[in-house]
């Protein structure tokens, strides 16, 4: 499911519960996706020893995965709500091609991989409603994404395993950073 249980506005199972605010819904959605990533990481870590490798050992890769930096305004130091929100949405849009790559990369967690992908789309929609400056958000070029996807899928098995691990780790870190920032807003 792309939305955590009980999050659908049509859910009537708990009529006395206060409806979630926009911020609470976003917070819960990110935690839901992080749980999904955790399950996917379990499968990849069981298959290879890459999870034990230090970040330095895995740093040499050609992936241009979104990453938070000081200039993005999401850290405690130099925090800027609007700049940060733009970075979070832009970063999530950039991750979408990598989440597409993750589909069919899992045997026992195929549904989980799909749930992470769909939940991220929902999260982007939630965040776009919150953002004031939508013009500043650049959407990735579909043609560039298509060729990137083809290139990633053409890698040998070892590189595909490495790519899967790096995507999951980077996406987890990006979401954790985003959550810390959103909780300051």
């Amino acid at each position: 499911a792309p939305v955590p249980p009980g999050e659908d506005s049509k859910d009537v199972a708990a009529p006395h519960r206060q409806p979630l605010t926009s911020s609470e819904r976003i917070d819960k959605q990110i935690r839901y996706i992080l749980d999904g990533i955790s399950a996917l990481r379990k499968e990849t870590c069981n298959k290879s020893n890459m999870c034990e490798s230090s970040k330095e050992a895995l740093a040499e890769n050609n992936l241009n995965l979104p990453k938070m930096a000081e200039k993005d305004g999401c850290f405690q130091s130099g925090f800027n709500e609007e700049t940060c929100l733009v970075k979070i949405i832009t970063g999530l849009l950039e991750f979408e091609v990598y989440l597409e790559y993750l589909q069919n990369r899992f045997e026992s967690s195929e549904e989980q991989a799909r749930a992470v992908q769909m939940s991220t789309k929902v999260l982007i929609q939630f965040l776009q409603k919150k953002a004031k400056n939508l013009d500043a958000i650049t959407t990735p070029d579909p043609t560039t994404n298509a060729s990137l996807l083809t290139k990633l899928q053409a890698q040998n098995q070892w590189l595909q395993d490495m790519t899967t691990h790096l995507i999951l780790r980077s996406f987890k870190e990006f979401l954790q950073s985003s959550l810390r920032a959103l909780r300051q807003m």
Partner: antibody
Amino acid sequence: QSLEESGGRLVTPGTPLTLTCTASGFSLSNYYVTWVRQAPGKGLEWIGIIYGSDETAYATSAIGRFTISKTSTTVDLKMTSLTAADTATYFCARDDSSDWDAKFNLWGQGTLVTVSS
Amino acid sequence: AIQMTQSPSSLSASVGDRVTITCQASQSINNELSWYQQKPGKAPKLLIYRASTLASGVPSRFSGSGSGTDFTLTISSLQPEDFATYYCQQGYSLRNIDNAFGGGTKVEIK
């Protein structure tokens, strides 16, 4: 797996001091690291945390005076403008970074910093 | 800024007693709360995280409950090695806070 703090000593007020947290049996690059201090006979006081290589967060009292930095094997706590109120045992602790909430599941034994003239 | 208030600050109990310590957050922190045990001259030790999940190697006489703003640590049957100071810690947000920890509860022998 263990953590060890070093660098604690007797210093005079105003002297800068750097404490170092060293990991054994694992790489710090895969974890978040926090610093916590405890004045004699008092409770635990959270100082700050380093997440990745450059994201940090600090307690309001630590902002501007304390700086946390990280390499693959060590995490440093740089302290400036020290006063007698900074006299405490300083602990570093590891957060396994697997979840979104901060929790510290591996601690060093602490290093004592005494600020006195 | 989130503040953590722990009570009582100290209590006296006997071996075999049921002991309850409470912790209150100034705003909702979901279930993102941990409990630590500290003995004199030693580093703190993680007992419980996510409000109710027992850390590895922690005896089952320790339990945690709560969500939102109100949390409880319970020791069902106090053992001699349980006399120590206990701290709660919020892990919800470490930005713009004075302290992530509660003030502590010292459990002494009656």
